[in-house]
């Protein structure tokens, strides 16, 4: 069986370094990985709770 | 719109194999996570495993290498392979996708697989 | 693995009650400011449905009488009036660190 990306991760692991351009910041495996290899954000509804901290070119829903 | 449906379900004696697979439309299975979760009769959610982007798999360690997630990009399907089934991996195995967050708001119908002699 | 541990694991209401649900989790499921932790909702018979995601982001058609709170290792499911169609079960769920878990579960019985 394959280990998980984040089998080592904690909790406390260093917040992720800005993605380069044309990447998006993958929260499930902690790393920048192309955009188009993740879902296509879907835009927030009006009055919807506001957004995680961008610490990344992280993909809001 | 993405739907999920499953198929490959059925009766199977202990040890036996079986396949399950997921045909997804309105999406590529190239793009963010596709699951298997089941659900034993009368049970909780149990998180089988996933597939990734990139074709990385990762499972519920308590399955103990029995399951292998594979895809089939040509045919926009992913496929659960079951070896050495028990009585007690009887359950109804559902397919689904997630968020970037992990949440799953995406299911197939579910398909039920009964391990029994 | 994180252990998710839901209470109770049922409870009877009645049609407008305010109903809460707990979740614990064995350690905190936080990364990057954000809570990975989610709520389902299931009938017999049928596959789980996304009710609120990053632990109070409500999904897209859910009726507002839904609402998650809670952050690190303590979260809560909320339905301000329960309706008759409420009636089911619920889950937890993290996606903090692999393998996923799901909580146990809560039974939303009819009193």
């Known amino acids: 069986m394959r280990r998980g990306p984040r089998s080592l991760r904690g909790r406390d692991a260093p917040a992720p370094t800005p993605c380069v351009p044309a990447e998006c910041f993958d929260l499930l495996v902690r790393h920048c990985v192309a955009c188009g290899l993740l879902r296509t954000p879907r835009p927030k509804p009006a009055g919807a709770s506001s957004p995680a901290p961008r610490t990344a070119l992280q993909p809001q829903e | 719109e993405v739907q999920l449906v499953e198929s490959g379900g059925g009766l199977v004696q202990p040890g036996g194999s079986l396949r399950l697979s997921c045909a997804a439309s309105?999406?590529?299975?190239?793009?963010?996570?596709w699951n298997w979760v089941r659900q034993a009769p009368g049970k909780g959610l149990e998180w089988v495993g996933y597939?990734?982007?990139?074709?990385?798999?990762y499972y519920n360690p308590s399955l103990k290498s029995r399951f292998t997630i594979s895809r089939d990009t040509s045919k926009n399907t992913f496929y659960l392979q079951m070896n050495s089934l028990r009585a007690e991996d009887t359950a109804v195995y559902y397919c689904?996708?997630?968020?970037?967050?992990?949440?799953?708001?995406?299911w197939g119908q579910g398909t039920l697989v009964t391990v029994s002699s | 693995d994180i252990q998710m541990t839901q209470s109770p694991s049922s409870l009877s209401a009645s049609v407008g009650d305010r109903v809460t649900i707990t979740c614990r989790a064995s350690?905190?499921?936080?990364?990057?400011?954000?809570?990975?932790m989610h709520w389902y909702q299931q009938k017999p018979g049928k596959a789980p449905k996304l009710l609120i995601y990053?632990?109070?982001d409500l999904e897209s058609g859910v009726p507002s009488r839904f609402s998650g709170s809670g952050s690190g290792t303590d979260f809560t499911l909320t339905i301000s009036s329960l309706q008759p169609e409420d009636f089911a079960t619920y889950y937890c769920?993290?996606?903090?660190?692999?393998?996923?878990?799901f909580g146990q579960g809560t039974k939303v019985e009819i009193k």
């Open positions: 689904a996708r997630p968020h970037n967050y992990g949440a799953m708001d995406y």
């Open positions: 309105g999406d590529s299975i190239t793009r963010g996570y």
């Open positions: 597939i990734n982007y990139s074709g990385t798999t």
């Open positions: 350690e905190s499921v936080d990364d990057y400011g954000i809570s990975f």
């Open positions: 990053r632990a109070s």
């Open positions: 769920q993290q996606t903090s660190k692999d393998p996923w878990t």
